[in-house]
Interface confidence: low
């Protein structure tokens, strides 16, 4: 599930962090949600997955792995946009919609090759593949118009993401599950 | 009452194929992902593969993947596991399981497994 | 070599509280990734014994439970009980590995005297 490195974070990951909360180590918090997000590694120097569990935690916590490196890697936004210019589609964009296999219900974001624009659909929480997108901005941002300029910005609208548990097991399963919104 | 049973186990040689089955019944069997699981003699367990509700999406542990597919009949209840170049070290007995009903990830139900064996 | 590391063997006897542990990383356990047990009686299929780190099925003696902290994960069996005797698994899911899903080496829980 990892997102692979980008070049631009070695070429600065001899910088200090841009804030002191991006030195903070991640932390998952005691809920038990599974909320796929990002944090800025120290000793790596680079955005990193972690799940985080939907309550307390610290701030170096993102919902997307941009959001990440425009925060706590000087000059990523710079860098960023030389790369971008002429940016092509990644190949991930034109893979099917796969939901994974866990139980969790996410909203998602995924590129649709057919239609040619980003689309919404429920990600299972673990497995599945990287056309998957938090939001439909960085959806966008990537697959629908690579290299085309600035997103949405503040006008993009973080929903928090909820895992509702599937009611229904195996007909012998008596479940105590909770809802974590 | 939720079943699953295995078949199709055997003895074959290295270099052969083995296709097993899982008949499932007592449950919605295209609503749930299944899997393999399997044990070699005197070992632990090992995630073989799985495959969503729909099978539209499959998975597959390093040891096997390029060799070993997994499909399912949802018209028939059934879920497969094609095994082509078997190795020794793939010699086990192999568990069907409903993956993910109760909780994100855990096995919820398992059959009584069928041995196979490579051996020359 | 297991991604998750248990203890080969525990005893203890009849009555007695015992504890397996089950140590795995930042990519897993740690990663806030669920942790499930099971139990595999001696020629018998696993069976799903505590699932999402401490949620016991419908069946499952109140004896077991579960509990996971940081890295590791334990499961605790009290008043421990002839029939006991089996060997126990932890399981969970891992974001650095292709195969995803992980297993404990396993742990023979032996019941003295």
């Known amino acids: 599930l990892s997102e692979e490195a980008d070049d631009t974070d070695s070429e600065l990951g001899s910088m200090k962090p841009l804030h002191t909360f991006c030195a903070m180590k991640a932390d998952d918090g005691p809920c038990k949600a599974m909320i796929r997000s990002y944090f800025f590694n120290m000793y790596t120097h680079q955005c990193e997955e972690f799940i985080y569990g939907g309550c307390e935690g610290n701030e170096n916590r993102f919902d997307t792995l941009e959001e990440c490196k425009k925060t706590c890697i000087p000059g990523y936004e710079k860098t960023a946009v030389k790369a971008a210019s002429g940016a092509e589609r990644p190949d991930f964009c034109f893979l099917e919609e796969d939901p994974g296999l866990c139980r969790g219900y996410m909203k998602r974001y995924l590129y649709n090759n057919q239609t040619k624009q980003c689309e919404r659909f429920v990600y299972g929480g673990c497995l599945g593949n990287r056309n998957n997108f938090e939001t439909l901005d960085e959806c966008k941002k990537i697959c629908e118009n690579p290299g085309g300029g600035s997103g949405g910005g503040l006008n993009d609208i973080f929903e928090a993401q909820k895992i509702e548990w599937h009611e229904g097991g195996p007909p012998h399963h008596h479940h105590h599950h909770h809802h974590h919104h | 009452q939720v079943q699953l049973v295995e078949s199709g186990g055997g003895l074959v040689q290295p270099g052969g194929s083995l296709r097993l089955s899982c008949a499932a019944s007592?449950?919605?069997?295209?609503?749930?992902?299944m899997s393999w699981v399997r044990q070699a003699p005197g070992k632990g367990l090992e995630w073989v593969s799985a495959?969503?509700?729909?099978?539209?999406?499959?998975y597959y542990a390093d040891s096997v993947k390029g060799r070993f597919t997994i499909s399912r009949d949802n018209s028939k209840n059934t879920l497969y596991l094609q095994m082509n170049s078997l190795r020794a070290e793939d010699t086990a007995v192999y568990y069907c399981?409903?993956?993910?009903?109760?909780?994100?990830?855990?096995?919820?139900?398992w059959g009584q497994g069928t041995m196979v064996t490579v051996s020359s | 070599q297991s991604v998750l590391t248990q203890p080969p063997s525990v005893s203890g006897a009849p009555g007695q509280r015992v504890t397996i542990s089950c140590t795995g990383s930042s990519s897993n356990i740690g990663a806030g990734y669920d942790v499930h047990w099971y139990q595999q009686l001696p020629g018998t299929a696993p069976k799903l014994l505590i699932y999402g780190n401490s949620n016991r099925p419908s069946g499952v003696p109140d004896r077991f439970s579960g509990s996971k902290s940081g890295t590791s994960a334990s499961l605790a069996i009290t008043g421990l009980q002839a029939e006991d005797e089996a060997d126990f698994y932890c399981q969970s899911y891992d974001s650095s590995l292709s195969g995803s899903v992980v297993f404990g080496g396993g742990t023979k829980v032996t019941v003295l005297g």
């Open positions: 495959i969503s509700g729909s099978g539209g999406s499959t």
């Open positions: 007592g449950f919605t069997f295209s609503s749930y992902a």
């Open positions: 399981a409903i993956l993910g009903a109760t909780s994100l990830s855990a096995f919820d139900i």
